[in-house]
């Protein structure tokens, strides 16, 4: 607001006030008058720039008189009463109401007072966030959008994340009229290791009091990943029975493992329980490469693990799981 | 009904002075300020000041600063300009009108002649 | 001060013709023009305050537009009963000054 007048009679105003499209907004203006000096308001008048006319009067013995009478209306000026206060009521916000309004006080005896103020048209756009659900590419693809709607003025995404990538933003306009909608589209290239990881995306506009932020949980569809682990190079005759574990990561889940040697079938020491497979004891040395192969919607690997069973006692701390 | 009702003709010589007077009726006459305007014969209007009842606050034309006292007597709701040191040129009907911004009421005229 | 400057000084035309006044301001004035009508030996009645807005009772024949420094006054079918003198008035500031009138004849 600007400072009050020294000695003279000062129209009060705020320089900019926002208003939402489609609601209403009051643009506020005052007439203050310093205690030893004395005025007469006889008219309060609104006009636009660059239109011609004024779009609201406010006269001492006609009262109101707007140029759209449907959206105007003086707030405070009532005949009858000291017209100090001209602010002004806007109904229906449209686009085309964004602009420069002077607000005027026809004063006695100091003459004409104005301010001039500014009305932001905004719209709050709503905000979505979404996964691209990706295979292994090989080359940056959109992993991750973000779509503010029906903005005024667009609103600004921005994409944090440990993980790197780049933001690719586009606007067009919205649904109403003078509105934009933004979408930014969070790019990578596409790894299991990202898979189930999290991005956030940061959405900020002039109608927020805060910025939103939308967390977006990243999907990579992949094969399996396969190792085998149980094997500690370390197994002895006579020793009792020991698991491996087929250990697979994929998205989306393994539908189903498949034990093998590089021979062929398992031989009869070796069971197969799902992801696991089951060593029983054995009474003679065994050097044995195992396969183990994991299948998902999307392939099938696998992995492969050479065990030796060997000769000599067992150490109180061999590899093998004792029952 | 608003009226303004203005004091009758004067004749004055050259350098004499002329005070006209305006008395209202059919509003609060403090609530709105009184202004006079004149016109000489065939010719355009001329504002020459005013004056706000409530506070006594005065605004006069330059051209007549010096010679024009605008004033009045809230008892009677009555305005009056007295206009000094008078010329031939001062020659023409006197308006007092109650202004909004604009005037939306004035006087009958009252027309005064300045002449040796 | 600020010069009004209006034209025609005087006009003749037919009743229901379309009349044009112009007022032009030597400076923006904004919206803070009045328009007067002044039949011989009568004082001026006001029409139009802030340029466009008609005083209630005042014939819908009669409109005022402009803003800044130009300004127009319209009578859109001229009846008998519109014979005077018009004047347009600016109230931006002291001293409020008046166009030097035009006079309206009828044909």
């Known amino acids: 607001w600007p400072p009050p007048g020294t000695g003279d009679v000062v129209v009060q105003a705020p320089t900019q006030v926002p208003g939402f499209l489609g609601d209403s907004v009051t643009l506020p203006c005052y007439l203050q008058v310093p205690n030893m000096e004395v005025t007469h308001v006889s008219q309060l008048t609104w006009a636009r720039h660059g239109e011609s006319g004024s779009m609201a009067v406010f006269h001492q013995t006609q009262g109101p008189s707007y140029s759209e009478s449907k959206r105007l209306e003086f707030v405070a000026a009532r005949l009858g009463a000291e017209l100090r206060n001209a602010s002004l009521r806007m109904f229906g916000l449209r686009v085309e109401d964004e602009g420069n309004y002077t607000c005027l006080f026809v004063t006695f005896p100091q003459g004409s007072r104005s301010v001039d103020i500014w009305l932001r048209v905004l719209a709050k756009p709503q905000n979505t966030a979404e996964v691209q659900k990706v295979q292994l590419t090989g080359e940056p693809v959109p992993m991750a959008r973000c779509v503010s709607t029906g903005g005024r003025p667009p609103a600004q995404i921005t994409w944090h994340s440990d993980l790197g990538g780049m933001p690719n933003t586009s606007q067009v306009p919205g649904f109403l009229s003078g509105t934009v909608t933004v979408t930014s589209l969070w790019i990578l290239v596409p790894s299991s290791q990202v898979d189930g990881k999290n991005v956030t995306c940061k959405v900020e506009h002039e109608s927020f009091e805060k910025p939103q932020l939308l967390t977006v949980n990243l999907t990579v569809y992949y094969p399996p990943e396969v190792s085998i682990s149980g094997y500690d190079n370390n197994w002895y005759l006579g020793q009792n029975e020991a698991t491996l574990t087929c250990d697979a990561r994929s998205n989306p889940e393994p539908t189903g493992y498949n034990w093998s040697t590089t021979m062929g079938p398992l031989p009869p020491f070796a069971v197969a329980q799902g992801a696991q497979l089951l060593i029983r004891p054995v009474d003679k040395p065994i050097n044995t490469t195992l396969i183990c192969n994991v299948t998902n919607a999307l392939g099938a690997r696998q992995a492969e693990l050479t065990v030796q069973v060997k000769e000599g006692p067992p150490s109180e701390h061999s590899g093998i799981s004792r029952n | 009904e608003v009226q303004l009702v203005q004091s009758g003709s004067e004749l004055k010589k050259p350098g004499a002075s002329v005070k006209v007077s305006c008395k209202t009726s059919?509003?609060?006459?403090?609530?709105?300020?009184m202004h006079w305007v004149r016109q000489p014969h065939g010719k355009g209007l001329e504002w020459i000041g005013g004056?706000?009842?409530?506070?006594?606050?005065?605004s006069y034309n330059q051209r007549f600063k010096g010679r024009v006292t605008i004033t009045v007597d809230k008892s009677t709701s009555t305005a009056y300009m007295e206009l000094s040191s008078l010329r031939s040129e001062d020659t023409a009907v006197y308006y007092c009108?109650?202004?909004?911004?604009?005037?939306?009421?004035w006087g009958q005229g009252t027309l005064v002649t300045v002449s040796s | 001060d600020i010069q009004m400057t209006q034209s025609p000084s005087a006009m003749s035309a037919s009743v229901g013709d379309r009349v044009t006044i112009t007022c032009k301001a030597s400076?923006?004035?904004?919206?803070?023009v009045a328009w007067y009508q002044q039949k011989p030996g009568q004082p001026p009645k006001a029409l139009i305050y802030?340029?466009?807005y008609r005083y209630s009772g005042v014939p819908d024949r009669f409109s005022g537009s402009g803003s800044g420094t130009d300004f127009t006054l319209t009578i859109s079918s001229l009846q008998a009963e519109d014979l005077a003198e018009y004047f347009c008035?600016?109230?931006?500031?002291?001293?409020?000054?008046f166009g030097q009138g035009t006079k309206l004849e009828i044909k």
């Open positions: 059919g509003y609060t006459f403090t609530e709105y300020t």
């Open positions: 008035q600016q109230y931006e500031s002291y001293p409020y000054t």
């Open positions: 400076q923006n004035v904004g919206t803070n």
């Open positions: 004056i706000h009842p409530n506070s006594g606050g005065t």
């Open positions: 802030s340029a466009s």
């Open positions: 009108a109650r202004w909004t911004g604009d005037f939306d009421y």
